[in-house]
């Protein structure tokens, strides 16, 4: 999972916060000498060696290709850039740079279906053929359709009532007019 490659390289968050609070903002406690505060590395760089004494420079190096740091830090190595997942139909919105991670997203007329905070699938928005759009497709939500008379909602698409089998939920939505119009997007089908 991104971010990756930093486990064990820096103190745990609780320890880090305690130690950081001993120094003014933008500085951190020297890894071997608690009485020295060193300047943190700028975003886009990582820590090579602590400052030898107060007022002397911390040695930082720019992140190599394929890695980044997005904020001031004292990481011993940069974080690995995220790769947009083609198998989830993701596209690259902006490439990884030394100071910012890759931004992945979806093509136009697609929404994001989340698996975890860092993993999502891009899914085509329902076009609502044979119906009208009740709620448009949003970043993380498919279109909500309202089907025309003679159609019912299944798999987020308006399907002809001739496809409705007896005893199915769609029977209610496929009654003869004037009730044919009354379709509820929450009654049947797939999101």
């Amino acid at each position: 999972i991104h971010p990756s490659g930093v486990t064990g390289l820096v103190p745990s968050l609780g320890d880090r916060e305690k130690r950081d609070s001993l120094c003014p903002q933008g500085k951190y406690v020297h890894s071997k000498n608690n009485s020295i505060c060193c300047t943190k590395c700028h975003k886009g760089t990582y820590l090579v060696s602590d400052c030898p004494s107060p007022g002397r420079d911390t040695v930082c190096r720019e992140c190599e290709k394929g890695t980044f740091t997005a904020s001031q830090n004292y990481l011993r190595q940069c974080l690995s850039c995220k790769t947009c997942r083609k198998e989830m139909s993701q596209v690259e919105i902006s490439p990884c740079q030394a100071d910012k991670d890759t931004v992945c997203g979806c093509k136009e007329n697609q929404f994001q279906r989340y698996l975890s905070e860092t993993h999502f699938q891009c899914v085509d928005c329902s076009p609502c053929f044979n119906g009208t759009v009740t709620i448009p497709c949003k970043e993380t939500q498919n279109t909500v359709c309202n089907c025309h008379a003679g159609f019912f909602l299944r798999e987020s698409e308006c399907v002809p009532c001739s496809h409705c089998k007896k005893n199915e939920e769609c029977m209610k939505l496929c009654l003869p007019p004037p009730l044919a119009n009354v379709t509820n997007p929450q009654d049947s089908g797939t999101a």
């Epitope: 698996l115 009740t134 709620i135 993380t140 939500q141 997007p185 929450q186 999101a191």
Partner: antibody
Framework: EVQLVESGGGLVQTGKSLELSCEAS????????MNWVRQAPGKGLEWVAY????????YYGDAVKGRFTISRDNAKNLLFLQMNNLKSEDTAMYYC????????WGQGTLVTVSL | DIVMSQSPSSLAVSAGEKVTIGCKSS????????????LNWYQQKPGQSPKLLIF???TRHIGVPDRFMGSGSGTDFTLTINSVQNEDLADYYC?????????FGAGTKLEIK
């Protein structure tokens, strides 16, 4: 850390109602589709209900359709299951599960429907 | 409704052996739009909640050991556990999310000899 915590289960008589809640934390709740799944004692898993991230799409299992209502409050990171006209066969452990792929699960809350 | 038939209902193997669990659906789970099979596999250890192992029939979820492998397409799917470990003692379920109502298989109880 992702957490889903179900509550509201307990012993209830046939024909009565009960509302289950699921509190989510550690992830962006409003981005995720959510589900309720149940498991009768010693039995397998049964899907109960689904709600999309923005509540625009809602679906139910055949066994609960017309009796159960799924809803969510994205501002409070809460998922609900309103269960009416309970039957003895609704006795089960009820789990809330997050993501379209059921990637996150709570520990469950036990609902016992007595005659 | 799509019916999911899982087999066997139980099996007992020794640690280190290979395990194969089958799942058949009453209709194809292959989505023609994205060419993905909407079939997931879950593991439920005794007294615990289920855990996602595999989605899209063959994609391992984050953190799942690579001894767990999913395969198959259309209506026939397989979960393979290569070199079973003692901690793999659990019930295993397949689930179709191709269409509503979603349906689980009846489960396979894996016991370690």
């Amino acid at each position: 850390e992702v957490q889903l915590v179900e509550s509201g289960g307990g012993l209830v008589q046939t024909g009565k109602s009960l509302e289950l809640s699921c509190e989510a934390s550690g992830f962006t709740f409003s981005n995720y589709d959510m589900n309720w799944v149940r498991q009768a004692p010693g039995k397998g898993l049964e899907w109960v209900a689904y709600i999309s991230s923005g509540s625009g799409h809602i679906y139910y299992g055949d066994a609960v359709k017309g009796r159960f209502t799924i809803s969510r409050d994205n501002a409070k990171n809460l998922l609900f299951l309103q269960m009416n006209n309970l039957k003895s066969e609704d006795t089960a452990m009820y789990y809330c599960s997050g993501s379209y792929w059921f990637a996150y699960w709570g520990q469950g809350t036990l609902v016992t429907v007595s005659l | 409704d799509i019916v999911m038939s899982q087999s066997p209902s139980s099996l007992a193997v020794s640690a280190g052996e290979k395990v194969t669990i089958g799942c058949k659906s009453s209709q194809s789970l292959l989505n023609n739009k994205d060419q993905k099979n909407y079939l997931n596999w879950y593991q439920q250890k005794p007294g615990q909640s289920p855990k996602l192992l595999i989605f899209f029939a063959s994609t391992r979820h984050i953190g799942v050991p690579d001894r767990f492998m999913g395969s198959g397409s259309g209506t026939d799917f397989t979960l393979t556990i290569n070199s079973v470990q003692n901690e793999d003692l659990a019930d295993y379920y397949c689930l179709q999310t191709y269409s509503f109502p979603y349906t689980f298989g009846a489960g396979t109880k894996l016991e370690i000899k």
